[in-house]
């Protein structure tokens, strides 16, 4: 029994709803009474949602899942996952049993955009070329972990003396703090770019020291 799911991961923003697509091809004369559908977490086999004995057996996953009952008879076994959380990320298996078996796994990739970075200087006054300054770039509430890039006013990457830390909060979202220690040149513009690798979203800010 061939069960089809998308090859690419399903990308869902935190807090939105996601559809994990799954389909099978019913034989002529198929009725829902013959169907046993099980959605489960691939790694642990924890039950997520099921359909059996001709009826929806309900969500076993924090009551945030639903099937598409009107589409099941046509072979649409997709699962709706509501209010996506970071903890939902992973692989879900769609298992279909009608006389014979079929299954396929679909990956859910969770994402959250990073906020526009805020920048702080230390020290923040009486600065001259040749002084060493610490610039902190902070961006919040993103997922997954960010990539951070620094550059000067000419667009030249600054890679030395950069320390980046990322801390997850209780929701699993990351706050990013990147510190650049630099000796001030004549051109005092410094840019920080925070990239979400899944969303291909760039959040950036710059500071000009005069």
């Amino acid at each position: 029994l061939e069960v089809q799911v998308p090859e690419d991961p399903v990308v869902a923003l935190v807090g939105t709803d996601a559809t994990l697509c799954c389909s099978f091809s019913p034989e002529p004369g198929f009725s829902l009474a013959q169907l046993n559908l099980i959605w489960q977490l691939t790694d642990t086999k924890q039950l997520v949602h099921s359909f059996a004995e001709g009826q929806d057996q309900g969500s076993a996953y924090a009551n945030r899942t639903a099937l598409f009952p009107d589409l099941l008879a046509q072979g649409n076994a997709s699962l709706r996952l509501q209010r996506v959380r970071v903890a939902d990320e992973g692989s879900f298996t769609c298992f279909v049993s009608i006389r014979d078996f079929g299954s396929a796994a679909v990956s859910l990739q969770v994402a959250a955009p990073y906020s526009k970075p805020s920048m702080t200087l230390e020290p923040n006054k009486d600065l001259r070329p040749g002084d060493t300054v610490t610039i902190t770039c902070s961006s919040y509430q993103g997922y997954p972990e960010a990539e951070v890039f620094w550059q000067d006013g000419q667009g030249v990457p600054l890679t030395g003396n950069v320390t980046t830390s990322q801390m997850a909060n209780e929701q699993g979202l990351f706050d990013v703090h990147s510190i650049l220690r630099v000796v001030l040149g004549a051109n005092g513009t410094y840019s920080c770019l925070v990239r979400n690798p899944v969303l291909q979203q760039d959040a950036h800010s710059s500071v000009t020291i005069t």
Epitope: N36, A52, I98, F101, G102, A104
Partner: antibody, heavy 114, light 107 residues
């Protein structure tokens, strides 16, 4: 009409090898997981191996007792499934059935004896 | 591994009698239970799948029920041709496992 026909059974000495074949007709072979199951008076019905679909990357699963000795394979163009059995033991003796979970062949007898 | 237990190894019933055969799983198998009939010298034949769906061509006197870990198959009015061994099998997880079988004979 669905038909599954096994072949390749027979008498083999312990440590020997044997390859079973099963040709299927009457359903779209490429869409079905295929299995080998064996039966003996001592152990009853015992699942041996399974091979899934191309879309499952032809994933295979084996009973612990045959892991490393038996290999299941399929040829969708020939609607056939195979079981290569190496290093056979007396306890591998039995009737070997190929099935798609729902539909079964008539079986082929494998006897491992000195 | 999931263990399937058919507690009754053999039983005899009169023609017309109702027969119930049970199968207990060692863990929840979420309805992925099939029942097979095997007559002497023949290969197993599917009777019931997904715990309660009757295979095409199987007489309506056969029925299946159950959920979780407890399943049963009922023959509403035993017929001489029902003399056979009946096996349950779970398809929830590999290794797939079978019950030990229940041999049903005519009294």
């Amino acid at each position: 009409e669905v038909q599954l026909e096994e072949s390749g059974g027979g008498l083999v000495q312990p440590g020997g090898s044997m390859k079973l074949s099963c040709v299927v007709s009457g359903f779209t072979f490429r869409n079905y997981w295929m299995n080998w199951v064996r039966q003996s008076p001592e152990k009853g019905l015992e699942w041996v191996a399974e091979i899934r679909l191309k879309s499952n990357n032809y994933a295979t699963h084996y009973a612990e007792s045959v892991k490393g000795r038996f290999t299941i394979s399929r040829d969708d163009s020939k609607s056939s499934v195979y079981l290569q059995m190496n290093n056979l033991r007396a306890e591998d003796t039995g009737i070997y059935y190929c099935n798609s979970h729902a539909d079964w062949g008539q079986g082929t007898l494998v006897s491992v004896s000195a | 591994d999931i263990v399937l237990t058919q507690t009754t190894a053999s039983l005899a019933a009169s023609v017309g009698e109702t027969v119930t055969i049970t199968c207990r799983a060692s863990e929840n198998i979420y309805y992925t239970l099939a029942w097979y009939q095997q007559k002497q010298g023949k290969s197993p034949q599917l009777l019931i799948y997904n715990a309660n769906s009757l295979e095409d061509g199987v007489p309506s006197r056969f029925s299946g029920s159950g959920s979780g870990t407890q399943y049963s198959m009922k023959i509403n009015s035993m017929q001489p041709e029902d003399t056979a061994t009946y096996f349950c099998k779970q398809g929830y997880d590999v290794p797939y496992t079978f019950g030990g079988g229940t041999k049903l004979e005519i009294k």
